[in-house]
């Protein structure tokens, strides 16, 4: 990996749990200054592999609300607006990091957690041909 | 919002920065026990809106490596394997949380950061009609 020269102004790390436990500032810095995060909000309807968005809420997690995509069809929408079953709608998934309250119900103590979320759907050529 | 009953066994929160600064355990708990995160690894090639994956590395960020999708074409691939310009390939983007070392180069002090990443591409009906 890349070795990072240590900044002498770093907070004290003599904690017995170090480096397992770190301090995190929850004031979120948003790097998306040149982009519109709502930009892809209509793709779910215009895609040839359209999807619905489902709200997944968990107060013990940060962020507490995550939107999950569920493909509407097994096949993809063709030029006539019909479902073409020679193609497959599939979810595009991504592993993301979230913070899980640990111990439970604690406002200032978390553990990193990795979860797999479906972000949207794409239309693919099938590789399994077992349907009539 | 949902009120969370406080656990009496929570760590002390008398820090002057509380609740802005919290403790986070970096031992990642992986919730994806019933899923294969590699499952969608071939979709980038089989999609009608195929994409390439590019490595984005930043040692000051956790995770330091993020893979970003870059659509291959302006249009979408049709049944003949050619690019069809009556449709548009577009990136599906998601805002994710990462940890940014703050102050820089510190191993045990971070700030939450929100970044927008392209996860894959999907094929959509165009709304911008500016091409021949």
């Amino acid at each position: 990996g890349i070795t990072i020269p240590r900044n002498p102004g770093c907070p004290n790390s003599e904690d017995k749990n170090f480096p397992r436990t770190v301090m995190v500032n929850l004031n979120i810095h948003n790097r998306n200054t040149n982009t519109n995060p709502k930009r892809s909000s209509d793709y779910y309807n215009r895609s040839t592999s359209p999807w619905n968005l489902h709200r997944n809420e968990d107060p013990e997690r940060y962020p507490s609300v995550i939107w999950e995509a569920k493909c509407r069809h097994l096949g993809c929408i063709n030029a006539d607006g019909n479902v073409d079953y020679h193609m497959n709608s599939v979810p595009i998934q991504q592993e993301i990091l979230v913070l899980r309250r640990e111990p439970p119900h604690c406002p200032n103590s978390f553990r990193l957690e990795k979860i797999l979320v479906s972000v949207g759907c794409t239309c693919v050529t099938p590789i399994v041909h077992h349907v009539a | 919002g949902i009120t969370i009953p406080r656990n009496p066994g929570c760590p002390n929160s008398e820090d002057k920065n509380f609740p802005r600064t919290v403790m986070v355990n970096l031992n990642i708990h992986n919730r994806n026990t019933n899923t294969n995160p590699k499952r969608s690894s071939d979709y980038y090639n089989r999609s009608t809106s195929p994409w390439n994956l590019h490595r984005n590395e930043d040692p000051e960020r956790y995770p330091s490596v993020i893979w970003e999708a870059k659509c291959r074409h302006l249009g979408c691939i049709n049944a003949d394997g050619n690019v069809d310009y009556h449709m548009n390939s577009v990136p599906i983007q998601q805002e994710i949380l990462v940890l940014r070392r703050e102050p820089p180069h510190c191993p045990n002090s971070f700030r939450l950061e929100k970044i927008l990443v392209s996860v894959g591409c999907t094929c959509v009906t165009p709304i911008v009609h500016h091409v021949a």
Epitope: T35, R39 | N56, E68, K70, R72, H73, Y85, N88, V128
Partner: nanobody
Framework: QVQLVESGGGLVQVGGSLRLSCEVS????????MGWFRQAPEKEREFVAA????????RYAHFVKGRFTISRDNAKNTVHLQMDSLKPEDTAVYYC????????????????WGQGTQVTVSS
């Protein structure tokens, strides 16, 4: 921050040719398409041509189709616009830009523009 530097404009006679270049730096990792645009005096900026970085496939506005050719040099992060059979109505300032959503990008979504390069076609 994306930096865009356009060059290659000038004064040319009707029927003549010019080759515009656009050097780009600071592109997002996910950037997949680049476009050329133009703005004539007292007119709105309009799309001219687009190309994908990976596939190299291109698209053109109807008014330049068959006369202009867009190309890219991935190694140098440069996009070119070869303009042939130029007409007086091609007179404008020409700009290049990253197209974050490819052909789906709307004109109001571009946050930054370079200085552009002036093309003047005289009869």
């Amino acid at each position: 921050q994306v930096q865009l530097v356009e060059s290659g404009g000038g004064l040319v006679q009707v029927g003549g040719s010019l080759r515009l270049s656009c050097e780009v730096s600071g592109l997002p990792v996910s950037s997949y398409a680049m476009g050329w645009f133009r703005q004539a005096p007292e007119k709105e900026r309009e799309f001219v041509a687009a190309i994908s970085w990976i596939g190299g496939d291109s698209r053109y506005a109807h008014f330049v189709k068959g006369r202009f050719t867009i190309s890219r040099d991935n190694a140098k992060n440069t996009v070119h616009l070869q303009m042939d059979s130029l007409k007086p109505e091609d007179t404008a300032v020409y700009y290049c830009n990253d197209m974050p959503y490819g052909l789906d990008t709307r004109m109001d979504e571009y946050e930054y523009w370079g200085q552009g390069t002036q093309v003047t076609v005289s009869s």
